[in-house]
């Protein structure tokens, strides 16, 4: 089949006339909306068949699909058909009219469907909304077909703007009919309860109108009956719920609760189970280890995290040096406790741009009327090392000394090194480490002081050089867990003038 113009999509002007031609090796016919519009059919001398469809005085209502197919069923590739889609942008036509049955979309399984709201102009922006909502739904739109996706049982409308007026389509109603497969879900208000509290479970079955619920529960083993209540969720068609309520739970009520749902028409069934734990009294339990010594780096933010399990929900307090902490208005401290599962919690203390004063003894206490737990640790603020001073002196004894002073937390290590060949060292040759070597060319004396108020160590190290016969680059490197700092000084022999 050959169609001219070939399409597959044409945009034609309103009020214009347009000619479509289809030709093939057997009789052909144009179809529009399952009908054959008036057309001229002919047979050429070469045996080719054709059909000419003349569209006159086009309006927006001529927008749609046009098919050319073989006109007989003599086995000449009868399934071959050519499709052409024509748009006739027409500001007087909003959405193309639908048959009544197109407004009601019924389905029996979860499958993709199309809401067939179509416009005459492929340039228009069309959005889909729930009938009672303004928010556009994120569903892909095809100007030739409409919105396709998986839809809930709701009412939908399409909207577009033509010129400066907003146009709404008719409402489309999506109905999911009763289906025979059973999908059961079971959930509990709480899966952990204290004895004396209530257990409430819900079993919901979707997609069937008539079902039978059967619960099995630990209490039944003892012949203690629980009467479930069945109701219909009115806002959700074919959602039937069975509620199992046990007042004043006992320890023996711990165990597996199973909801079995049967549907007698097709004899389908499904069951789901959930575990319930009844505890004698509430509990708070730490999960995982938190070291008794924690570190934070000066001026960096640090979050300290404690994970624990508790039931019922606990109160969580943080203390520093036995004083209660709260979220500070200056934003220096943030406290948060998140419920990450029914009984699991994560409590976090965040120190923003840590200061030296925030070092100290921290405690987290989680408690309720039945139990409590606390966790303590020492927070050490780590301060990167700084070399504060590197100086050289010539005592009368003839030796030369270099003094290096620096600070940091934790305690810095000091490394002395020297370059004798100033041209090549340290780029080409490694520096020589200095220290209390056996050759006694150099001697080292190091003193360490802890400054309580600043909560850091000060290191003072003096390097004594016995005889310096040529210029020497002496380097002092301080290093600790959070950084290092280096300074160097040129030491010249006594005899050399500066």
């Amino acid at each position: 089949l050959v169609v001219t113009p070939p399409g597959p999509e044409l945009v034609l002007n309103v009020s214009s006339t347009f000619v479509l031609t289809c030709s093939g090796s057997a009789p052909v016919v144009w179809e529009r909306m399952s009908q054959e519009p008036p057309q001229e059919m002919a047979k050429a001398q070469d045996g080719t068949f054709s059909s000419v469809l003349t569209l006159t005085n086009l309006t927006g209502l001529d927008t749609g699909e046009y098919f050319c197919t073989h006109n007989d069923s003599r086995g000449l590739e009868t399934d071959e058909r050519k499709r052409l889609y024509i748009f006739v942008p027409d500001p007087t036509v909003g959405f193309l009219p639908n048959d009544a049955e197109e407004l009601f979309i019924f389905l029996t399984e979860i499958t993709e469907i199309t809401i067939p709201c179509r416009v005459t102009d492929p340039q228009l922006v069309v959005t889909l909304h729930e009938k009672k909502g303004d928010v556009a739904l994120p569903v892909p739109y095809d100007h030739q077909r409409g919105f396709s996706g998986i839809f809930e049982d709701r009412s939908y409308i399409c909207k577009t703007t033509i010129g400066d007026r907003e146009v709404d389509s008719d409402a489309y109603y999506v109905y999911r009919l009763q289906v025979s497969s059973i999908n059961v879900s079971v959930n509990a208000v709480q899966t952990v309860v204290r004895q004396g509290e209530n257990i409430t479970l819900m079993c919901i079955v979707i997609g069937n109108e008539v079902v039978n619920f059967e619960w099995t529960y630990p209490r039944k083993e003892s012949g203690r009956l629980v009467e479930p209540v069945t109701d219909f969720l009115l806002d959700m068609p074919y959602h039937i719920r069975s509620i199992l309520h046990i007042p004043s739970a006992e320890l023996e009520d711990s165990g597996t609760y199973t909801c079995n749902v049967t549907e007698s028409v097709n004899d389908h069934q499904d069951e789901k189970a959930i575990n319930i734990t009844v505890v004698e009294s509430g509990y708070v339990r730490l999960l995982g280890e938190v070291g008794t010594l924690q570190f934070a780096e000066l001026h960096r933010s640090r979050t300290l995290q404690v994970v624990f399990e508790a039931y019922p929900p606990p109160t969580v307090l943080w203390f520093k040096d036995n004083r209660t902490l709260g979220d500070s208005s200056a934003g220096e401290i943030a406290l948060s406790t998140r419920n990450v599962s029914e009984t699991r919690y994560v409590s976090e203390l965040t120190l923003v741009r840590v200061k030296v004063a925030e070092a100290g003894h921290y405690t987290m206490r989680a408690f309720h009327e039945d139990a409590e737990v606390q966790l303590s640790f020492q927070l050490q603020i780590n301060v990167p090392v700084r070399v504060l001073e590197l100086s050289e002196s010539h005592p009368d004894s003839g030796e030369q000394t270099v003094r290096c002073r620096g600070r940091g937390m934790p305690q810095p290590n000091i490394i002395w090194s020297a370059c004798r060949d100033l041209k090549r060292c340290p780029r080409e040759l490694p520096p020589t480490l200095l220290g209390n070597s056996s050759e006694e060319e150099s001697q080292l004396e190091t003193n360490v002081t802890y400054w309580e108020e600043e909560q850091e160590f000060e290191v003072v190290s003096t390097l004594r050089l016995q005889h310096v016969d040529r210029p020497l680059s002496v380097r002092c490197t301080l290093r600790n867990a959070v950084g290092q700092d280096t300074q160097e000084v040129i030491v010249v022999p006594h005899s050399l003038p500066f």
């Epitope: 039944k220 083993e221 003892s222 012949g223 203690r224 007042p247």
Partner: antibody
């Protein structure tokens, strides 16, 4: 200690009425479903009625349905069995029971004799 | 109603014998069966629940088994204090129903 004490039994004529009571103690009465069971002389056991803890649901054996009514007063820790249109085959020892470990707690029973 | 057919109605045993009582339910009762002992002039006493779970005061010579519709109750080593009537009870479906009872006597 769980105790169930039945009362109200006696000799009545066929067609007449009787109301049995069962006073419960030693447990939280309002948390438990309660039952009546009977045993005819030299015969077996027959379950006759059940009432749920909250007074909402009641079940009966076919043999007593429409004639007997089970009820409870949780504020008085008391279970009742109102028996109307009594027949000779209702002659039995009537036991009140608490639902745990099916029928693990029994009262001593009260004897109902229906005879002309 | 679920019919419970208990057999035999009576049983003679010598001390030290093993005896077995059977109960057949009219339908699957999913192991929800209990066994009671009733001595003459006394109230029934629960021995076993949920097919095979012995009550805390039930001697270990008593046992229960079964599934679906067929259940049995055994005394492995009959003692004189075991002379009584025994009843099965299905408590899967309301109305709960008892078996007709088995009277155990000494030979």
């Amino acid at each position: 200690e769980v105790q169930l004490v039945e009362s109200g039994g006696g000799l009545v004529q066929p067609g007449s009425s009787l109301k049995l009571s069962c006073l419960a103690s030693g447990f939280t009465f309002s948390n438990y479903n309660m039952y009546w069971i009977r045993q005819a002389p030299k015969k077996g056991l027959e379950w006759i009625a059940l009432i749920f803890y909250d007074n909402n649901n009641k079940y009966y054996a076919d043999s007593v349905k429409g004639r007997f009514t089970i009820s409870r007063d949780n504020s008085k820790n008391t279970l009742y069995l109102e028996m109307n249109s009594l027949r000779s085959e209702d002659t039995a020892m009537y036991y009140c029971l608490r639902d745990s470990g099916p029928f693990s707690y029994w009262g001593q029973g009260t004897l109902v004799t229906v005879s002309s | 109603d679920i019919q419970m057919t208990q057999s035999p109605p009576s049983l003679s045993a010598s001390l030290g014998d093993k005896v077995t009582i059977n109960c057949q339910a009219g339908q699957n009762i999913k192991k929800y069966i209990a066994w009671y002992q009733q001595e003459p002039g006394k109230v029934p006493r629960l021995l076993i629940r949920y097919t095979s779970k012995l009550e805390s005061d039930t001697p270990s010579r008593f046992s229960g088994s079964g599934s679906g519709r067929d259940y049995s109750f055994s005394i492995s080593n009959v003692e004189s204090e075991d002379i009584a009537s025994y009843y099965c009870l299905q408590y899967d479906n309301l109305p709960w129903t008892f078996g007709g009872g088995t009277k155990l006597e000494l030979k």
